[in-house]
Structures are given as structure tokens and as C-alpha cells.
Interface confidence: low
Amino acid sequence: IPTEIPTSALVKETLALLSTHRTLLIANETLRIPVPVHKNHQLCTEEIFQGIGTLESQTVQGGTVERLFKNLSLIKKYIDGQKKKCGEERRRVNQFLDYLQEFLGVMNTEWIIES
Amino acid sequence: IPTEIPTSALVKETLALLSTHRTLLIANETLRIPVPVHKNHQLCTEEIFQGIGTLESQTVQGGTVERLFKNLSLIKKYIDGQKKKCGEERRRVNQFLDYLQEFLGVMNTEWIIES
């Protein structure tokens, strides 16, 4: 897959592939994978991709199922790149506070918070 | 502060405190703090709280500004707890795929993705 494919298109294609190969992927009845118990997915990217690795090692490769795992590894690459950008630029306190305020604002309105 | 305060209320109070103490916090003109360059905040919690630590060490404590940093440390505690819950429960492949699909769905609709 060319890495030039826009990430948004990559995600859409991966969702379609996941749907297509679901039956094959769930064939292993005994396999157990850690699943996060909340919906703040971005906090759990490491565990999600560890789970994908476990699944890949247990799945017969070939055809479009291989493309699914290739896509997922490109998505991981994108997320790793985003994580690198978390601490790349040093800015004034003012700008840091803007980001902190935005983060808390998003946490306040969009996170699924259990008290 | 009692940790029994619901996290949602804690976040709201922290936003108010941050607003009130902004002038005091930006007093240090020379301080530079790493600021993420994208809006997928959850990926950057580690860097955000490192920045808060830097800011705290440079801020004259006392009164409600102390409460601000106490609140922020409670929010960090909550997020750390959420991160622990990322890999706590081992489930069937079926349930993992549900979560993965949900994650990709959220990424597809809610993430700010630069190609």
C-alpha cells in the first residue's frame, strides 16, 4: 500500500476490511485479548495495537486479510507520528495554557467520564 | 480536596480556576513548555502533565492557585486509572474486534486527521 494514501481513506478502508474478515478473525475460540473497559480509546492505543499483533500472529495470512493488517500497521505508524508531535515544539506558557484549557474543555464535553 | 468529588465537576472547577489564575501563570515570560501541535489531546496526556509539573515548579503557591494544581493532579490520577483499565480484562476476539471497530469508527468521525 502506498503510504501516500490519506489516513482518513485508510481508516475507512480498514473498517470495511475488518467487517469483511470478521468471520475468519473470530475463528480462534480459545484466544483471549486484553480489551479496554472504557471508551476513551485514544488513551489505549498501545494496548489496542498489542492486541492486533496477537491477532495477526494467530491468523492465517494471505489475500486481503494481509492488507487489513498492513493497513492497521500504517494506522499505528500514523498514531506513533502523532505521539511524537506531542512534545516537539516548545512554546510560551500562554500557548500551553490554551492547549490545557482546550484539553480540559474536550474532557468536559466529549469524554465518557465515570465518577 | 476530597477525591470523592465527581471527575466531571472537578474538570469544570479546574477550568474556572485556570481562567482565574491565568494572569499569574503567564507571568513567567521566559518559560517555554512543549505544546502538542495537533488536537488529538488524549494521545498527549503524558506531555500535558509534564508541562503542568514544569509550570507548578515555577509558580508561587498559595490560596486557590494551589487548589488548581491539586485539581490537576487529581485529574492526572483519574487518567492514569483509565490507562490502567486499557489492558485489565482479557476477552474473546469478538469483543476485541468490537472495540477495534469502535476505535476506528471514532478515528474516522472525530479525530482531526492531517493527511
Partner: nanobody
């Protein structure tokens, strides 16, 4: 267009009290969904940071007014209040109310009022 209008300012002796009000014109504006605050600007000085902030029931105060000033909001009437007790000459200033999403007054103020003058004499 939403406008914030302050009232209740005036002249008072040190130790006295005043209650400032801030009303919004425009039916679409609801105080309950905004972060609301009071600011002040003394003659010849820059506008100070927020004196008091209220956001969805949570309040915060600057050290200089804590224990003397109380911020509150009447969501039904869409009015923001600032009860000022034990006033000091250094409280003399033009007082402004402001509204913003997520309390981001400095980088993204949504609405500002025109201000109401408070004068405290010794």
C-alpha cells in the same frame, strides 16, 4: 447580536457593599452553557485577569477578592451577579462581565460588556 450589559456600579465608602449585575440581550444566549466572569480595569492600568469565574456551578476567585466578592448566576433570568463586600479604595475600577466557551477568556473571548464604574473612597 448578543450584548452583555452591566449595571449596579456607583460610588461607595470603604467597607461598603455593591452588587453588580450583567444581563444578556438576545434570546439565544444562555448563561448556563458559558463560562462567565468579571474583570476590572483601574485608571491608567491594563485590564486585570479574571476576578471571579463561574462555570456550570463551579466558582473561582482571584486572591485579591477572595472572601469579599461572590459571583453567582440566575440561569432562569440569564443574569450574572457580583456581590462585592468590604470594598477598598484599590477596588476602584471599571468592571466588565465576559462570557466564553471553556473559560478561554484571553485567547477567545466570545462576548464582553461595556463596563460599569465602581468608585470606592476612603
Amino acid at each position: 447580536q448578543v450584548q452583555l450589559v452591566e449595571s449596579g456600579g456607583g460610588s461607595v465608602q470603604a467597607g461598603g457593599s455593591l452588587r453588580l449585575s450583567c444581563a444578556a440581550s438576545g434570546n439565544t444566549f444562555s448563561f448556563s452553557t458559558y463560562c462567565m466572569g468579571w474583570f476590572r480595569q483601574s485608571p491608567g492600568k491594563e485590564r486585570e485577569g479574571s476576578l471571579a469565574t463561574i462555570y456550570d456551578g463551579s466558582t473561582a476567585y482571584a486572591g485579591s477578592v477572595k472572601g469579599r466578592f461572590t459571583i453567582s448566576v440566575d440561569n432562569a433570568k440569564n443574569i450574572l451577579y457580583l456581590q462585592m463586600n468590604n470594598l477598598k479604595p484599590e477596588d476602584t475600577a471599571m468592571y466588565y462581565c465576559a462570557a466564553a466557551k471553556y473559560c478561554m477568556f484571553w485567547s477567545d473571548p466570545s462576548y464582553w460588556g461595556q463596563g460599569t464604574q465602581v468608585t470606592v473612597s476612603s
